[in-house]
Interface confidence: low
């Protein structure tokens, strides 16, 4: 039978000799050299070889255990004379013996963390995590113990567990907000020659209401005028709160004071300001002077801080009225008034009312602000207000006049105030309609009676209440004996149409139609256009090829025979 | 130290949507103020908008009809939207911290290197 | 909103000089304003905070004044480093608004 144990190999041997492993050896092995043993299985005959003859294994190459722990290898002893196996094949193990040639590994090179700052001693903070290679069944190899490099005496780590904890009382945010802790994770039980990594622990405090607010002076000073609405910011106030988000947000309010009802406080809640504002309407004959208290407190205080003190602080506000002699005021904010285009000179419009709001009512005088109107269209009487015409009107030209009323008081004429005066001019018909553009066009030679040459289009600069109507229609002068008609088309275009077959571009090569065109409004206006129509050789498709090269443009007239 | 890096499309179509990322290392966004401030072309520079630690976004008047911050703390990123794009949109965009600790301090103390966005067709 | 002007909007000077940047505002915003530096290719940085504060970092050859409408930022004897663009900010109200900002190169 075989006669081995277990094989123990140690680990990344370093000799300049194979590494000796152990004997395979059975018991009917005479010495004579009539056996052969033969080797098989994991990294048989190139890490592990076997001398045939006596058994003896040796390892060829250094061996990690962290890579592979255990080798299974098969054995044979067979007689070389007759190749009969005189054991049977066997299977036998190498065990990779563990030494300590890993150091610990943290699970993060950097990890971060957060504690609340004031935290009481031993407070959980964050818990590290090293790890080691190396055999955790044998020896000490890989039993890690934890150790602070850096922190204290901030901070403490609990050896086995690697659990970081607060160790000290009372750290404050507002002194220092972060903290790099180093730790070190050691093999061996923590033991000399043992192995180490380190990690590095950002730990910022967070914040808790621990600061109350505080104002940075005791008193303040605002001035306000007396006309000032309710509602007016009249100044700013702030506190400042070391704290930081929710525990820094600071609420104002008025706790006392002979102002405590012509005045509000409001609190900003972005700037973190306190904004004073007028509350009622203020009066600088009945009081000159208010005086507040303002109070600024933490809506959100943690009762372990109460010790502290109070989470609020006060100042003192005083308010100094101003005294206010106010500008005339106009009846209205702006004025609309209307007038005819053909309105004469001296015509009123409309007038205009401004009254002084002190106490004194004081006579006010009227005018116009002449950079307003720098045509001096229009006047106004400084006694009562009216507004009158001082020029002829052109609604063509300008349909709104945008001028400025001023209203000064005649004792003091440094008050003064200003409206907008909004003057419509209306319509009257007063403009002839007229073509929209040149019409010249042609005739074919061989036209047929009645047929369309030209549209016609007019324009008019009125602008009637119930729209535009034109009518066409050839001038007198034109209308008997005229080769072309005019088809007015009750939409405001009419037609030229050919009034017979055929024209002969050598006897007449041009026309001169005279065309009236009038609206139908009051009083009724109209006007003459003339179109211009050359005869002219076409394809059979009615396009033109040739006409004769006279001069495009004619002046008004008539050419005899249109 | 605190540091921030905007990231996103250099270019971008009219009426199309700008998004950027500001990703911030070295801090957490869920302390302080995180902003977006761009620069035109001539170097006018305009304030859009803020995120806070909580969450609560504040924004210009004049852009907050079009525009929208948002963030991932688990990320330690915030982002800006800006919608409708036009031509005048073009400018660098930079994300910064606000020190706001003791109340109101709205000026910014770390600034991204900022990112130029174009909008063109 | 309020309205910040800052001049001049360019300023070449040399090495150990003193330049002074000015600040105006619409309206009084008492000193809640701050005022940036911006190098080519980096990002912004804070110099000064309500009005004439040091934000830690900023060399003291830096000096913020005034307070309602009008500031100054006077940089002392001028280092190679100092030549950016330099903006300020005001933060008494929302909309926050900025300056056009003072381009500061070596002469």
């Known amino acids: 039978s075989w006669m081995w144990n277990q094989f123990f190999l140690l680990e990344e041997y370093t000799g300049s000799d194979y590494q000796y492993v152990g004997k395979l050896h059975s018991d009917q092995d005479r010495g004579d050299g009539s056996l052969k043993y033969i080797l098989s299985g994991d990294g048989a005959g190139d890490l592990f070889i076997i001398n045939e003859n006596t058994g003896d294994i040796q390892a060829t190459k250094r061996l990690d255990r962290e890579e592979k722990p255990v080798y299974i290898l098969r054995a044979q002893a067979i007689n070389r004379r007759t190749g009969r196996p005189v054991e049977p094949e066997s299977e036998f193990i190498i065990k990779i013996h563990d030494i300590n040639d890993n150091e610990p590994i943290f699970t993060k090179e950097v990890y971060t963390a957060t504690v609340p700052e004031m935290s009481d001693v031993g407070t959980f903070v964050v818990q590290v995590t090293a790890t080691d290679a190396d055999d955790p069944t044998y020896g000490n190899s890989a039993k890690v113990v934890y150790s602070i490099l850096q922190g204290q005496p901030y901070f403490s780590v609990e050896s086995e567990t690697g659990i970081i904890k607060t160790a000290l009382l009372n750290m404050d945010r507002e002194n220092r907000e972060q903290y790099q802790v180093v730790i070190q994770a050691k093999d061996m039980g923590g033991q000399m020659g043992g192995l180490s990594g380190t990690t590095t622990v950002n730990i910022t405090l967070t914040d808790v209401n621990d600061n109350p607010p505080r104002f940075p002076q005791s008193t303040y000073q605002f001035k306000t005028p007396e006309s000032s609405p309710p509602g007016t910011p009249i100044g700013r106030i702030k506190a400042s709160d070391a704290d930081v988000g929710e525990n820094a947000e600071i609420e104002y309010s008025i706790t006392d004071g002979e102002g405590l009802d012509m005045f509000d406080v409001i609190t900003d809640q972005e700037t973190q300001e306190g904004i004073i504002t007028v509350k009622k309407l203020l009066d600088f004959e009945k009081k000159k002077v208010y005086t507040l208290k303002v109070e600024a407190s933490n809506p959100y205080v943690e009762p372990r801080f109460l010790y502290l003190g109070p989470f609020k602080d006060s100042a003192t506000v005083r308010i100094v009225v101003e005294d206010v002699d106010e500008p005339p005021v106009f009846s209205k904010l702006a004025y609309i008034l209307q007038i005819r285009e053909d309105a004469q000179i001296n015509t009123t419009i409309g007038s205009v009312t401004a009254q002084d709001p002190d106490a004194a009512r004081n006579p006010v005088k009227y005018s116009v602000d002449r950079h307003t109107d720098m045509d001096r269209i229009f006047n106004i009487d400084s006694g009562n207000g009216s507004i009158f015409t001082s020029k002829l009107l052109d609604r063509e030209t300008l349909l709104w006049h945008n001028i400025t009323v001023i209203a000064t008081e005649i004792n003091n004429p440094k008050q003064s105030s200003r409206v907008p005066l909004y003057i419509k001019v209306l319509d009257v018909n007063d403009n002839a309609p007229e073509f929209a553009e040149f019409y010249e066009t042609f005739v074919c030679e061989k036209a047929k009676a009645d047929q369309l040459i030209q549209t016609l289009h007019a324009v008019d600069k009125d602008d009637p209440y119930s729209g535009h109507q034109f009518s066409f229609s050839l001038a007198p002068e034109a209308a008997s004996g005229s080769n072309f008609t005019i088809q007015d088309n009750k939409d405001n275009t009419a037609g030229i149409l050919t009034r017979k077959n055929g024209y002969n571009r050598h006897e007449m090569s041009t026309y001169l139609l005279p065309v009236v065109i009038s609206d139908n409004d009051y009083p009724v206006q109209s006007s003459t256009g003339t179109v211009t129509v050359r005869v002219c050789a076409c394809d059979h498709h009615g396009n033109m090829q040739s006409c004769h090269a006279e001069a495009l443009i004619h002046p008004t007239g008539l050419s005899t025979g249109a | 130290e605190v540091q921030l890096q905007e990231s996103g499309p250099g270019l971008v179509k009219p009426s199309q949507s700008l998004s950027l990322t500001c990703s911030v290392t070295?801090?957490?966004?869920?302390?302080?103020?995180w902003g977006w401030i761009r620069k035109f072309p001539g170097n006018k520079m305009e304030w859009m908008g803020y995120?806070?630690?909580?969450?609560?976004?504040s924004y210009n008047p004049s852009l907050k009809s079009r525009m929208s911050i948002t963030r991932d703390a688990s990320k330690n990123q915030f982002f800006l939207q800006l919608n409708s794009v036009t031509t005048d949109d073009t400018a660098t965009y930079y994300c910064?911290?606000?020190?706001?600790?003791?109340?109101?301090?709205?000026?910014?103390?770390?600034w991204g290197p900022g990112t130029m966005v174009t909008v063109s067709s | 909103d309020v309205q910040m002007t800052q001049s001049p909007s360019y300023l070449a000077a040399s090495p150990g000089e003193s330049v002074s940047i000015s600040c105006k505002a619409t309206?009084?915003?008492?000193?809640?304003l701050a005022w940036y530096q911006q190098k080519p290719g980096e990002a912004y940085k804070v110099l000064i905070y309500s009005g004439s504060t040091l934000q830690s970092g900023t060399p003291s050859r830096f000096s913020g004044s005034g307070s309602g409408t009008d500031f100054t930022l006077t940089i002392r004897s001028l280092e190679p480093e100092d030549f950016g663009l330099y903006s300020c900010?005001?933060?008494?109200?929302?909309?926050?608004?900025f300056g056009s900002g003072t381009k500061l190169e070596i002469k």
């Open positions: 309206k009084s915003i008492s000193n809640y």
């Open positions: 070295g801090y957490s966004i869920t302390t302080y103020y």
């Open positions: 910064a911290r606000s020190p706001i600790n003791h109340g109101g301090y709205w000026y910014f103390d770390f």
């Open positions: 900010q005001q933060y008494y109200e929302k909309p926050l608004t």
């Open positions: 995120i806070s630690y909580s969450g609560r976004t």
